[in-house]
Structures are given as C-alpha cells and as structure tokens.
C-alpha cells in the first residue's frame, strides 16, 4: 500500500502535487509498512479495542487562516478516556481517586511503555531496531527522551505527508509559500506503541485556509456603550477602533503596515500607520465603516524579464521596483503583476486586508455627575441607618435605570448593589435616595443606563455618626 491509499481520498491534481511542495514533507506515493502499522477502515471492529477503557479522541486545530508565505501551525491533542492521563515518563496512568465505569483501578498503569521498551530485544548498540521506524521505514529521531514518546502522528495534506513521534500533544508548522490559495484539508492519523508494532487509535481531519488577503479583525470600544458587540454606538462620544491582524507566525513583523479608514459619514479618508484610531460620529444613523490594510510582505520573485531591446538603455537593478500588488486568486506566486527582481531573491509584494462593518449611531447618556448630596433627616431620634439623597445630572438621552454600588473606601469590596427604574424630567435632573448602615467612608458608584448606554460616576462619601451637628462630607469626587 502507498500512503495515499491509507491516509485519505483527497487526491490533488498533478498540477497541485507539483506546485505545492512542502518543505520537509514527502510524497504520498511512498510505500506504507502495513505490517508495522496496520490499516483499519472506518467501522472496523478492531477500533473498539484499540485502547484500554474506551476510545481516544484526537482534536486537530490550526491557527488558520494563514497569509500565503507565512507559517501555519497545526496542533493535535489526544483526549483519553475518563480517569486516564499521560505521566512524566510518557506512560498512560489512571488518575488517583478518580472513578470511571469500571470503578477504581488496582493497576496504576493503562499502558506501561517504559517496561515494554526495557524488555524489548533485538536492538543494536545505538538503540535502533527494525520496529523503531515510521510507516515509510525512516528511523525515529533519537533525541534525548525519545523513548518517552509513544505516539506516532502522520499528517497528510496536498499529496504529501509528515511523520512525527510525540507525546499526547504535538505541533507541526508548515510554510505556506507554495500552497494553493483557498481551503485545504489536513488529515492526521495517530498510532500508539504496541509491543514491536503499532496500533491506530485515532483519525482526525480539519480544513485550513491559505489566503492572499491579510486576515483583519477590528475591535470597537466606546465609553458608556452598553454592549460593544452589537455594533450600536453613541453619538458625540469617541469610538476607539483597534485593528488586530491575524499573524500568529509574525510573518508581517518587519512590514510597514498602513491603515486606510473611511467612516462612512462624509469625513473623508483617514490614513494612518497606527493600528488604533478614534472617531466620533456627530449624527444619528447607520454608517458603513471601511478599512483597507496594506502591508509590504516577503513574496515570490517573478521570472526574469526578457532581455531589453538594444535601442533602450538597461535600467540598473537598484532602480527596479521592489514590490508588486497581489489581489488575484490562484497559486501563490503566479500573479503576473507589477513585479521586480532583486539580486538576493528577496522580493516584496503588497498584500491587502479589508474590513467592513455597518454601525448604528444612536443617542446615549454621555455624562453623569453627582452635583449634591444631602443627609435626609429622619423622624426617629437616633436611627441606625442614614438616608442620603444624591442629586444627579446627566447629558444625552433619557436614563431608564439607576444603579448604585456601595463599597468600601478602596472601591473594591462591594457591600450593596441596588438598581431600579428611574423617571427623569426633561432637564435630566434626578434624586437618588440610598440607605447607609452606620457611619464611615463609602465608595459610591452611580450608573445611569438606558437601552444602549451606561454612564458611571464615582464618589467617596463620609457618613458621620448620627449626631445631628455632624455634616455629610463628599470625601473625594
């Protein structure tokens, strides 16, 4: 059998096989050693007994999408049946005091591979034997502690495979310079040691994406905005836009990145090299936000141009263009655009990313202030608690609720939270009455809210002993 017979039905075209050469990977036309690495079809009854105590689940993730030319990293994590874990020696053991369906186990080991490898014979002085090999016959790499690595992972994509010895979690990085744009499939088959052979325990596949568009995300934050994820913001308060470029392999670390903003409110284009920008909308309505990100990234060099006609002078290499634009699909590096060749083969290509959002601007509570505090005199001669009136003003829309959070003087330990609907007059002036149990200094956080906004003000107040002569003090506002 060949690798492609074992590892999946995805058969790339001859063109793809030729153009998608992954560094360090091998062709799936190679032979697979079925004696050492048996192959079981889906539904084969042997899967049921491939692991003691249940099935092992493999979880495959990647940091896709990847900008073409960058590295994409795949991670596989094995999830063992309940109460099982891998120990420091790579053996699979039962967790202490953990009960599964079979109850508590007397044997601490699920698989004691250390004992197996010490018993194994037929090895020469290098520790090499005919069974310490991958499915294609290549020997295991003998770095320190390799004997504690008891799982064999075979990654397969684009007509190529990569073999890795590992523990219950492995990572593999692939450079995408030669990968065709678009969605691709990665498949992983996992084997475990079994005496002098191996047993399949899990198979998993996941789609990853290679793109020539810079993956861009924008987070938006605005003070007093009640829900930052609903893309509804408040008029007359700045919104902070923060651009996050998904570049886990730091491919664009040395690139100059330009951000071109259009806020959709006829304020024109705003160009910046900073990933954050503030913008204030002064009208209510719905606006289309557009961002274009441009970065000069390392890219493939074009083929050399045909020799120039004798009648024209040859331009020097120093004056040739060093960058070109890419916006067309197809295999990376196959864009016959504005290209240049430089002697050391380090060419640059302009990559673009786009972000578009429709945001709604509404009225909101812009500001809230406590303008007065009054100790309410109670009819009882020496009550245990104090009633205090906070006279509050606000700007913007009509609040519908008021919350007071009363806490210790550091404003960290909440003692009491009270929220209630509020009826506010046209002037946005209201009085909030709250009870304070006992004298002392309190931190008061007062918020006014409506459907879309939440405005906060804080103050420290000093509630005196209930001597009528003691005045109420605003300790700090």
């Amino acid at each position: 059998k060949r690798f492609h017979d074992v590892l999946g039905n995805e058969r790339p075209s001859a063109y793809m096989r030729e153009h998608n050469q992954l560094n360090g990977w091998s062709s799936d036309e190679n032979d697979w050693n079925e004696k050492l690495y048996p192959v079981w079809k889906r539904g084969d009854m042997r899967w049921k007994n491939s692991w003691k105590g249940g099935r092992v689940q493999a979880v495959l993730t990647s940091d896709s999408p990847a900008l073409v030319g960058s590295n994409i990293t795949f991670a596989v994590n094995l999830i063992f049946p309940r109460c099982q874990k891998e120990d420091a020696n790579g053996n699979i053991v039962y967790e202490k005091n953990c009960r599964n369906e079979a109850g508590l186990s007397a044997d601490p080991y699920v698989y004691n591979w250390t004992a197996w490898s010490e018993d194994s014979d037929g090895e020469n002085g290098t520790g090499q034997s005919h069974h310490n090999v991958f499915p294609d016959g290549k020997p295991f790499p003998h770095h320190p502690g390799w004997r504690r690595w008891n799982f064999i992972y075979v990654f397969h994509t684009l007509g190529q495979y990569f073999q890795k010895l590992g523990r219950c979690s492995v990572r593999v990085s692939v450079n995408t310079a030669n990968v065709t744009l678009g969605p691709q499939l990665m498949e992983v088959t996992v084997y475990r040691r079994h005496g002098r052979a191996y047993v399949p325990i899990a198979q998993v596949k996941d789609v990853y994406v290679v793109t020539d568009q810079i993956p861009v995300f924008v987070t938006m934050f605005q003070k007093n905005d009640r829900n930052s994820s609903d893309e509804t913001f408040l008029k007359d308060l700045p919104i902070m836009f923060d651009v996050l470029i998904h570049d886990p392999s730091h491919f664009l670390n040395y690139s100059t990145i330009n951000y071109k903003w259009s806020f959709g409110d006829n304020t024109g284009l705003f160009v910046s090299t900073n990933h954050t920008v503030n913008h204030t909308y002064v009208l209510n309505g719905t606006f289309s936000l557009n961002l274009t990100v441009k970065a000069a990234a390392p890219g493939p060099c074009p083929p050399p141009p045909p020799p120039p006609r004798p009648s024209k002078p040859t331009p020097s290499l120093a004056t040739t263009l060093k960058s070109y634009d890419s916006n067309t699909p197809g295999p990376a590096g196959d864009n016959p655009l504005e290209l240049s060749r430089i002697p050391d083969e380090n060419c640059q290509i302009n990559r673009y990313g786009h972000f578009q959002a429709t945001i709604t601007i509404v009225e909101g509570i812009l500001e809230v202030n406590i303008i007065q505090m009054t100790d309410v005199l109670m009819p009882v001669p020496w009550p245990e608690s104090s009633l205090i009136d906070f006279v509050v003003t606000c700007q913007g829309s009509i609040p519908t609720e008021v919350c007071t959070i009363i806490s210790d003087p550091t404003c960290e330990i909440t003692q009491n939270t009270v929220c209630s609907p509020v009826d506010v007059d046209e002037m946005c002036l209201l009085t909030v009455r709250r009870t304070f149990n006992g004298s002392g200094t309190y931190c008061v956080n007062l918020t006014l809210g409506d459907d879309t906004s939440l405005a906060l003000t804080s103050t420290l107040i000093s509630v005196p002993d209930r001597d009528p002569a003691s005045p109420l003090r605003m300790a700090n506002s």
Epitope: I398, T400, T404, N416, C419, S420, D423, R433, T435, D451
Partner: antibody
Amino acid sequence: EVQLLESGGGLVQPGGSLRLSCAASGFTFIRRPMSWVRQAPGKGLEWVSSISHSGGSKYYADSVKGRFTISRDNSKNTLYLQMNSLRAEDTAVYYCARKWSTFDYWGQGTLVTVSS
Amino acid sequence: QSVLTQPPSASGTPGQRVTISCSGSSSNIGNNYVSWYQQLPGTAPKLLIYADSQRPSGVPDRFSGSKSGTSASLAISGLRSEDEADYYCGAWDSSLNAYVFGGGTKLTVL
C-alpha cells in the same frame, strides 16, 4: 391635560388571548416609561408590567412572565398589553399608568373577565 | 401575601390625625422611593405622595409622607369624610425587579 384611555377588555375563555390598548395624550409620550397595573374584584393593586420610553427595557411580574407582552407604538402614542394563555386569576380591571418608579397618572381601567 | 405590609384598616373622626404604616425591606422601601396612592370607591387610583414625602400639585398639604429605614408612613391630618378611601403604598423592589404594592388600608371616617 394628561389623559390615558384603556380599551380592549372583555370576556374571554381560559387559555384565550386579548390585547389591551392605552391611548395617551396631553404629554410627550415618547419621553415617558409606561406601566400596566391590575386590580382583581375586591382585591388590592397588583403591578403587571412596565416599559421604557423607547421600548428597549421591559419588566414583568412573575405571575405574567412568558404569557403577557408589553409594547408601545410611539408614533401612535399607544401602549399595548398582549395577554395570552389567560387564566381565571387574570380577571381584573387593568389600568394603564404613566411612568414606572411611581405612577403619577392613571387611566380609568378596562375590565378583563376570564371565564368559561 | 403582599411584599409590603399595611394594616388592613384604619379609622378616625373628622379633624383627627391618622397614620397608616407600610413596612418592607432594604430591597424595596430601604433603598427605593415610596409612593402612596388613594383609591376612592369606584374610581381609579390617584398618586398622593411620591419620593417618600413629595406631594404632586393639587394634593392638599393635610397629606404627608415619611420614611425611616425599611418603613414608611402616610399621615392625614384634619381628617375629612371625603378622605374615606383605600390607601396603597408602593415601591420598586430591586431584588424582585418588580414594583410592589402593600395590600391596602381601608380608611373609614367615623
């Protein structure tokens, strides 16, 4: 002069539905929260539901939660109460009231009778 | 069973001063404004006192409200026969997220 006029009451069978309306005039309806309060025959007042000026915040008494829906049409200066899955214990005079932290103006009420 | 507790009845003779109590907890009366409503026989309720002790315009100053801790009271001085009605206290309850009323007090002018 503030006026609140309820309508839509009547006799309905248990499990049935009814929609009450409250036409408001004499004040800026769009700037005021509104509420419904009911009173069963010979009994005390029971708050039913309240809604913010824009309709974005709504509150309900536990006894009606999931069955009643409060809404408003600010362009028509009208408050509504959609009552579904009505029970005998919902029989009451339903009052429309202005505001929600205190009820400063009340309508004359509309009688809802739930009976088979 | 009402969240706010009022005496079911109260009485007085014309010219007398009568007080109706309303007791609750810190989640309602203790931290929210109390209102008082008057309901004359066969009519809709009417706001008498708001924000613990404030009178809306048109309400005679014979009616006054006060609050101490988790209790509130309505005082009617110079009692008149037209004051014969049901009186309800009410407040927002921040724990229940609901407006709560007392069970009502029937005032009889003897």
